[in-house]
């Protein structure tokens, strides 16, 4: 029997899946706070637009009986169980917020006919790309691969005069959900990253990684890994590193680099950190006061999901259009809306665009500094620091393959 959508006659609801298995180990109360804060803002915006309507959220909790591991790897069926709950209750909002786990989202897409929009704070994997009614509010793996390929190919910057075409990828399987799918995308033989490289090898053991650092016969000077500096230190410790090794540490959802008193530890000097440009206002928000720098982005994605719902509601109501239509379900893409922290842009496939930031450690000040930024919307790298104080020779990034014979440096222009 049909599930009725609580989505007409001046009353509009968003169904929020509150799953034990989540992309980030975030207490559900914090997610709820983010949603409620978003609802307050949406109500204000609709009122200001002269739209006298009611907007609410219904939180759908999983019972946690079957899926109690709390991580995304065991979440394949949890989203479907929650959908069954909705089906049994015969009640659904205009929009579904969640799940954040790639497996859950993928499975829900396979097993259901989703005629309503779905917003996710996560679903990072390539298997969730190009889904017609899915919107993802945290950078998916596809965006990372586009940055890496763009950066590898770049050879006309004062600090990067070589195109790279090789890489090691460290992936030991203990990564967080975002890292798991980011590295998965780099590992996949069909991915854009693999396609554009002439050599790529996945290192799965700590010892493999440690050996490469000083191996004269290594096939690449570049190692991509994902995690925070502490994760790198546990792996690398204070081991000696060959002078032309470059470690790219992907740590997108971590604002700790942008705290004023942070000094980069010595083991970070051979490392370029890829993270995201931080927002300002979120830091003082009532729901985020107790969040660590790594949790803000997840809570913010939920809040922005609510604001996106509000934006679409406003747009359709102002145009006198019906909300419970396929047109509404497919409209959550190719737009910019006013997020909590400024404008948020979604690409043609409903994936959030962002500014990625590549940081290096200044050998002079031992502080993190911005080397370049990358706009995912236009796939463009913008150099910021034209004379970086690198640890690498001549303050330039080395070639990805060390010349073992006479030192002829060929510039691949």
């Amino acid at each position: 029997s049909q599930v009725s959508q609580n989505c007409h006659n001046g009353s509009y609801e968003i169904s929020v899946l509150m799953m034990d298995n989540s992309a980030f180990a975030e207490p559900l109360e914090n997610v709820e706070d983010a949603v409620n804060e978003g609802l307050e803002i949406v109500r204000g915006r609709l009122q200001n637009a002269g739209l006298n309507v009611t907007v609410n959220a219904s939180f759908m909790y999983s019972d946690g009986l079957i899926h109690n591991s709390g991580d995304c790897r065991s979440s394949t069926c949890e989203g479907l169980d929650l959908l069954r709950k909705i089906s049994n209750a015969k009640r659904m909002g205009c929009v579904l917020m969640g799940p954040s786990c790639t497996y859950s989202t993928f499975q829900m897409y396979l097993d259901t006919e989703l005629s309503y929009p779905m917003i996710s704070a996560g679903s990072f994997g390539l298997s969730c790309d190009y889904k017609e009614t899915l919107t993802r509010l945290m950078s998916p793996a596809r965006k990372l691969t586009y940055f890496l390929v763009n950066f590898w190919k770049t050879n006309d910057l004062p600090f990067k005069t070589y195109s790279w075409s090789t890489s090691y990828v460290y992936k030991n399987g203990t990564e967080s959900e975002d890292c798991f799918w980011y590295l998965n995308a780099l590992e996949a033989s069909v991915s854009y990253f693999s396609h554009e490289l002439s050599f790529k090898l996945v290192l799965r053991q700590d010892k493999e990684f440690q050996d490469i650092l000083m191996d004269h016969n290594r096939k690449s000077n570049v190692i991509v890994m994902c995690g925070d500096p502490e994760f790198l230190y546990k792996l690398k410790g204070d081991r000696a590193v060959a002078e032309d090794i470059v470690i790219i540490l992907v740590d997108l959802f971590n604002d700790q680099y942008f705290e004023d008193n942070v000094t980069a530890p010595d083991y970070m000097k051979n490392v370029l950190v890829l993270t995201q440009s931080p927002g300002n206002s979120l830091l003082n928000s009532s729901f985020s006061r107790n969040l660590s720098p790594t949790k803000r982005d997840f809570a913010l994605a939920y809040l922005n999901g609510i604001l996106l719902f509000g934006h679409m509601l406003k747009t359709f109501l102002e145009n006198g259009e019906n909300i419970t239509t396929p047109k509404f379900a497919h409209a959550f893409r190719n737009l910019t809306f006013e997020g909590y922290d400024g404008p948020v842009t979604l690409d043609d496939w409903g994936d959030v665009d962002s500014t990625m930031v590549l940081l290096y450690t200044s050998v002079d000040t031992k502080k993190y500094k911005v080397l370049l930024t990358y706009d995912t919307h236009v796939n463009q790298t913008n150099p910021v620091d034209m004379s970086p104080t690198f640890t690498w020779k001549n303050s330039k990034l080395p070639n990805d393959i060390t010349d073992r014979g006479p030192q002829h440096h060929h510039h691949h222009h």
Epitope: F258, D260, V357, K369, V370, N382
Partner: nanobody
Framework: QLQLVESGGGLVQPGGSLRLSCVTS????????IGWFRQAPGKEREGVIC???????KYADSVKGRFTISRDNAKNTVYLRMDSLKPDDTAVYYC?????????????????WGQGTQVTVSS
Amino acid sequence: QLQLVESGGGLVQPGGSLRLSCVTSGFTLDDYAIGWFRQAPGKEREGVICLTSGGLPKYADSVKGRFTISRDNAKNTVYLRMDSLKPDDTAVYYCAASGATSRWNCPPQYDHWGQGTQVTVSS
């Protein structure tokens, strides 16, 4: 003493590009936030872009995706690259500096200003 000198302005057609330079002296760029501002005839001065002392660019919505900022500490110079220029971008462009209290945020106000360079976008 602390000085800022802008250059690179001129007349450009809509859709064209310009690169403005701000040569600084009397201070270290690492310790200062640099802002670019503009003032069109009969309008108030507005912030266009700021580069925090840590090197984080922050853009006004009106120029995001079109303007980029970079710095070369070795040359004590900050650059403003302007692409896809529109007639609305016509103004005198100023660079300004402020001793950084935060490495990652733009200051509320700037203490030191250049004399400005004229940018005219017209066909």
